[in-house]
């Protein structure tokens, strides 16, 4: 039975040209995390594999940095980065947990970030 829950940074906004941290945290389960995928629509941005570490898609290697933790840092944001991002935790024996984050990249300097949390 899947008992875990994923907390995310929720809906967040950031300024064009700036950077943002996408963060998810899996709790309430003792399942082993074997891999975390970060996806945007049908594109795989990055993978953090328990054995092989981080691998960033060649399409994003100049603008995506791994971490902190199992999170992902997006840099040099453009308006086209606006949209849904998914953290997909592959675990054993539970299976797959998915978290959703909506990022809005704003032209103005009044971008306000949604509530953040610190991973303990």
């Amino acid at each position: 039975m899947m008992t875990g829950t994923i907390e995310t940074t929720g809906n967040i906004s950031a300024e064009k040209g700036g950077s943002i941290i996408l963060q998810c945290h899996l709790s309430s389960t003792t399942a082993q995390v074997t891999q975390v995928n970060w996806e945007q629509q049908d594109q795989l941005l990055a993978i953090c594999n328990a054995d092989l570490g981080w691998h960033i898609s060649p399409s994003f290697k100049d603008r995506v940095a791994p971490g902190p933790g199992l999170g992902l840092t997006l840099q040099s944001l453009t308006v086209n980065d606006t949209g849904e991002y998914f953290c997909i935790y592959h675990t054993y024996p539970d299976g797959t947990y998915t978290g959703r984050i909506f990022l809005e990249v704003l032209e103005s300097s009044v971008a306000e970030h949604g509530a953040r949390f610190q991973i303990p």
Epitope: Q43, N49, I88, H90
Partner: antibody, heavy 118, light 110 residues
Framework: EVQLVQSGGGLVKPGGSLRLSCEAS????????MSWIRQAPGKGLEWVSR????????NYADSVKGRFTISRDNAKNTLYLQMNSLRAEDTAMYYC???????????WGQGTLVTVSS | SYELTQPPSASGTPGQRVTISCSGS????????VNWYQQLPGTAPKLLIY???QRPSGVPGRFSGSRSGTSASLAISGLQSEDETDYYC???????????FGGGTKLSVL
């Protein structure tokens, strides 16, 4: 130019051994995981083995586990595949390739033919 | 056994659009991105599409990829005679802890 140059194939009897080499140039070899992939005559591609960038972690396909050993020498920019207890079914073109395969293998060696026959 | 299933053959006429399918499971295509390779006779495979739909530099825009659930497809539009060769899909497989390749599809340009 980014390239992988392979050597070490040939004809070997069943039960014999062979070592393949793959020399990298044009990129920082020590930054990349590397893999071996093979292709039996007229057949499809089969992943054989992988080693991480510093050589501390390796993985093998079940078909070669316990018989093949992947290794690397980052000082020499070279990847190796030691093949022992060879069988007729190991006959194939062997390719080295850059990466573990999550986002595909972007650089391939030219291939080296291994024939296991008595 | 672990499997990505491709049709053994496909065909089209010059200028036409053809698609090649690749079917997998939750442990591979359902969990990781799909990559496609083109292999000309007597040469090493060449990466054609990575991360489901991304083209490496130098690959013509006629080639495109998509993924849905546990299946993927490669589309080739404006088919040309030089496209007549073998195509392989691949995806990382969690159980194999390595990439899994499809059996390959031989494309004929009629």
């Amino acid at each position: 130019e980014v390239q992988l140059v392979q050597s070490g194939g040939g004809l070997v009897k069943p039960g014999g051994s062979l070592r393949l080499s793959c020399e990298a140039s044009g990129f920082t070899f020590s930054d990349y995981s590397m893999s071996w992939i093979r292709q039996a005559p007229g057949k499809g591609l089969e992943w054989v083995s992988r080693i991480n960038s510093d050589g501390s972690r390796t993985n093998y396909a079940d078909s070669v586990k316990g018989r093949f050993t992947i290794s690397r020498d980052n000082a020499k920019n070279t990847l190796y595949l030691q093949m022992n207890s060879l069988r007729a079914e190991d006959t194939a073109m062997y390719y080295c390739a850059r990466g573990p395969g999550f986002f595909g293998f972007d650089i391939w060696g030219q291939g080296t033919l291994v024939t296991v026959s008595s | 056994s672990y499997e990505l299933t491709q049709p053994p053959s496909a065909s089209g006429t010059p200028g036409q659009r053809v698609t090649i399918s690749c079917s997998g499971s939750r442990s591979n295509i359902g969990r990781n991105s799909v990559n496609w390779y083109q292999q000309l006779p007597g040469t090493a495979p060449k990466l054609l599409i990575y991360s489901n739909n991304q083209r490496p530099s130098g690959v013509p825009g006629r080639f495109s990829g998509s993924r849905s659930g546990t299946s993927a497809s490669l589309a080739i539009s404006g088919l040309q005679s030089e496209d007549e060769t073998d195509y392989y899909c691949a995806a990382w497989d969690a159980r194999l802890t390595g990439p899994l390749f499809g059996g390959g599809t031989k494309l004929s340009v009629l």
